[in-house]
């Protein structure tokens, strides 16, 4: 109706949001799976990590990811310099010194080795979704979420709040 979606319009300034404090408010080691219960796995290939979305064989151990939670100010959409409450951001690390990164140019999700402080591309707004699912919105590209495409993780643009419930951007977190 306004030529720009609610998600895009409201979150266009997410990259301006300030993360409160350098250290995370808490950390959580969990396995990550899709809405359809496929596992997200990480494999070392040619000295770099690849990310896969696959069905695990029975009794096959799930890969774990360390989620680090950060409290962040949410920027106001009115003036652009105000604050409209708080939100939770996460970084995701499947192994020491490697973090999931949003590659907005390639619309891909990659594992990069890096030192702290982590770049903005490693931060994702965590959304609490229905059916015990979450979704991950890019800090650097509001309205763009981690999703599943062709058995890989990819960046998927969500053009309206109605599409926030699209199954391919919904994930489950589990301690087992």
């Amino acid at each position: 109706a306004f030529g720009i979606s609610g998600v895009q319009k409201y979150t266009r300034a997410l990259h301006d949001s300030s993360i409160t404090g350098i250290s995370p408010i808490t950390e959580y080691l969990a396995s990550l799976s899709t809405y359809n219960d496929q596992s997200i796995t990480f494999a070392l290939e040619d000295e770099s990590y690849e990310i896969y979305v696959e069905d695990l064989k029975k009794d096959e151990k799930k890969d774990k990811v360390l989620l680090s939670y950060y409290e962040s100010q949410h920027p106001s959409n009115e003036s652009g310099d105000g604050v409209d409450g708080k939100m939770l951001m996460v970084t995701l690390s499947p192994t020491k010194d490697f973090w999931l990164h949003a590659n907005n140019k390639e619309h891909s999700v990659e594992l990069h080795k890096c030192e702290k402080p982590l770049p903005d591309q490693a931060f994702f707004v965590l959304h609490n979704m229905h059916s015990n699912c979450v979704s991950f919105e890019c800090k650097t590209d509001p309205g763009v979420f981690i999703g599943v495409k062709d058995n890989h993780l990819a960046l998927i643009k969500v053009d309206s709040s109605e599409n926030l419930c699209t199954e391919n951007i919904l994930f489950k977190l589990s301690e087992t």
Epitope: G85, L126, H130, E162, L164, C165
Partner: antibody, heavy 119, light 111 residues
């Protein structure tokens, strides 16, 4: 400035109906989950219903299921609560609330509108 | 449903004193590694105001004298030094699962 303004409260007889409205401003309405929370006179807070930003999901407390309907019109930045088959125990101040961005907690509250169910 | 029990029901203190409010859940409110327990302040004739989210994080514009702690089922709201404007009713609330539930409230009154 983020604002929520409720309206539509009043006196209604048991078995009657009422529709509450909540006009939102200062934020992109469709990006946020919205809820109704009520408070009976001199009592504590009770969550009533929630609707997701895209209208896909709704949830209700058991005591109002089948009687109350939460809805929203994102083009009008307005949240509604249709209340049917009202009972004396529904008498309360009804607050409109907005979740934070990401939908983890009730962050913004309106001033409330009083609903009185009495004969 | 998750039942939240607050204690004490009333706390009578003087300005400058430390207030400690308790909230106990009937089951864990942990989800995704977060303690989804929030605290609200309500003054007469006013709507509730978010003080603390996810057990220990202050809402926007909330003074540092307010702090939250706890995990699992036991949580505490502490006001380090009461100001005159802090005398109010305080509610804990869980956002782990539907139905979202509130504690019955603790009234902090002037002694």
């Amino acid at each position: 400035e983020v604002q929520l303004v409720e309206s539509g409260g009043g006196l209604v007889q048991p078995g009657g109906s009422l529709r509450l409205s909540c006009a939102a401003s200062g934020f992109t309405f469709s990006s946020f989950s919205m809820s109704w929370v009520r408070q009976a006179p001199g009592k504590g807070l009770e969550w009533v219903a929630t609707i997701s930003g895209g209208k896909t999901f709704t949830d209700y407390v058991d005591s109002v299921k089948g009687r109350f309907t939460i809805s929203r019109d994102n083009s009008k930045n307005t949240l509604y609560l249709q209340m049917n088959s009202l009972r004396a125990e529904d008498t309360a101040v009804y607050y409109c609330t907005r979740a934070n961005y990401g939908n983890w907690f009730f962050e913004v509250w309106g001033q409330g509108t009083l609903v009185t169910v009495s004969s | 449903e998750i039942v939240l029990t607050q204690s004490p029901a009333t706390l009578s203190l003087s300005p400058g004193e430390r207030a400690t409010l308790s909230c106990r859940a009937s089951e864990s409110v942990a989800k995704y590694g977060l303690s989804l327990l929030n605290w609200f302040q309500q003054k007469p004739g006013q709507p509730p105001r978010l003080l603390i989210f996810a057990a220990s994080n202050r809402g926007s514009g909330i003074p540092a004298r307010f702090s939250g702690s706890g995990s699992g089922t036991d949580f505490t709201l502490t006001i380090s030094s009461l100001e005159p404007e802090d005398f109010a009713v305080y509610y804990c609330q869980q956002s782990k699962e539907v139905p979202f539930t509130f504690g019955q409230g603790t009234k902090v009154e002037i002694k």
